[in-house]
């Protein structure tokens, strides 16, 4: 028994629902007293849901499970996640038996934006050419973790002197703060790009330090 | 009607190795799943191994894993059970049988005996 | 030791109703069907009830099985002498993807 599944992972945003999608071809005949169903996590075959002699079995995943009950018979076994959670990435086996049997595998890669970066410095006043200054970059509730990039006002990376910490949350979500230590220019932009690798989404924070009245030594 | 034939059970020593086949006629080989199950002398039903119609995908019990290995040929209508690294533990009668509904089995052989004895 | 529990006997006279019990957990009998097999002496095993309750054809109406939860059962009614045999319930393991058969249960005609 063919059973299909998409090839690449169902990406689902924190606390929105997902269709983890599954699909087999009904013989001519067929009725839904045949069809058991087994939905479970792939590596710990935990119980997710299941369908059972023509009954929805419910789910055994926290009651965020639920399938289609008017596409079964027509082949379609997908399974709706309700508000996503970062603890539900992985993957999920979609496992059918009839008169014969087949599963399949589908991933879930769960993600979540990260805010615009807050931008601190540290000294933050009497600046003067020369001086080491700190300059942090912070972002919040995004996965997975980030990529974190340094750029002056011309674009150029700055790759030296940063240091990235990433903290999860209790819910499993990242707060990424980039310190960069530079020695000051006359003036000049420092920008910080918190990058999500899976929603392909930037978040850029900038500071400038301008108009200083420096004198050069 | 619908049959199951096993064969190639025997004695062998622990550590050997056996064959056994079970030719199928009367349904549409193919479109079934198959399984293996075995009986101990005077015990109860075990449950071995299961193979789908096309082949692709395999259930063993734990007790077998990495020892034994269900195969088919649907061009001949034969399931197969090779048996490796045998144990006295492994004496049975060995039964071929049809996948059915709701993980039943409708069809049975009249199986075939392995004993694994020095 | 089976995943599913039996009585290993029973016991009944003619024309009587016998049941025998059949218990599991929420990863077998709680999650897909129970199916129950008839073996009469020195013969193979042979298909009693399906999905919990369905016979298949061929199989008298005297035989009947339900299911609840993670118990199922087995019921003879009008006992015959032919009765006389080994039962056994079977299911599929959802956490462990294998198939289970229970102890088996020696049904004695007297």
């Known amino acids: 028994l063919e059973v299909q599944v998409p090839e690449d992972p169902v990406v689902a945003l924190v606390g929105t629902d997902a269709t983890l999608c599954c699909s087999f071809s009904p013989e001519p005949g067929f009725s839904l007293a045949q069809l058991n169903l087994i939905w479970q996590l792939t590596d710990t075959k935990q119980l997710v849901h299941s369908f059972a002699e023509g009954q929805d079995q419910g789910s055994a995943y926290a009651n965020r499970t639920a399938l289609f009950p008017d596409l079964l018979a027509q082949g379609n076994a997908s399974l709706r996640l309700q508000r996503v959670r970062v603890a539900d990435e992985g993957s999920f086996t979609c496992f059918v038996s009839i008169r014969d049997f087949g599963s399949a595998a589908v991933s879930l890669q769960v993600a979540a934006p990260y805010s615009k970066p807050s931008m601190t410095l540290e000294p933050n006043k009497d600046l003067r050419p020369g001086d080491t200054v700190t300059i942090t970059c912070s972002s919040y509730r995004g996965y997975p973790e980030a990529e974190v990039f340094w750029q002056d006002g011309q674009g150029v990376p700055l790759t030296g002197n940063v240091t990235t910490s990433q903290m999860a949350n209790e819910q499993g979500l990242f707060d990424v703060h980039s310190v960069l230590r530079v020695v000051l220019g006359a003036n000049g932009t420092y920008s910080c790009l918190v990058r999500n690798p899976v929603l392909q989404q930037d978040a850029h924070g900038s500071v400038t330090i301008t108009g200083q009245p420096m004198t050069f030594p | 009607e619908v049959q199951l034939l096993e064969s190639g059970g025997g004695l062998v020593e622990p550590g050997g190795s056996l064959r056994l086949s079970c030719a199928a006629s009367?349904?549409?080989?193919?479109?079934?799943?198959m399984h293996w199950v075995r009986q101990a002398p005077g015990k109860g039903l075990d449950w071995v191994a299961v193979?789908?119609?096309?082949?692709?995908?395999?259930y063993y019990a734990d007790s077998v894993k990495g020892r034994f290995t269900i195969s088919r040929d649907n061009s001949k209508s034969t399931l197969y059970l090779q048996m490796n690294s045998l144990r006295a533990e492994d004496t049975a009668v060995y039964y071929c049988?049809?996948?059915?509904?709701?993980?039943?089995?409708?069809?049975w052989g009249q199986g075939t005996t392995v004993t694994v004895s020095s | 030791q089976s995943v599913l529990t039996q009585p290993p006997s029973a016991s009944g006279t003619p024309g009587q109703r016998v049941t025998i019990s059949c218990s599991g957990s929420?990863?077998?009998?709680?999650?897909?069907?129970v199916n129950w097999y008839q073996q009469l002496p020195g013969t193979a095993p042979k298909l009693l009830i399906y999905?919990?309750?369905q016979r298949p054809s061929g199989v008298p109406d005297r035989f009947s099985g339900s299911k609840s939860g993670t118990s199922a059962s087995l019921a003879i009614s009008g006992l015959q002498s032919e009765d006389e045999a080994d039962y056994y319930c079977?299911?599929?393991?959802?956490?462990?993807?294998?198939?289970?058969f229970g102890g088996g249960t020696k049904l004695t005609v007297l």
């Open positions: 049988t049809k996948y059915y509904y709701n993980y039943a089995m409708d069809v």
């Open positions: 009367g349904f549409s080989f193919s479109s079934y799943g």
């Open positions: 193979i789908n119609g096309e082949g692709s995908g395999t």
């Open positions: 929420r990863t077998d009998i709680g999650t897909t069907s």
């Open positions: 999905q919990s309750h």
């Open positions: 079977a299911s599929w393991d959802a956490s462990q993807n294998t198939w289970v």
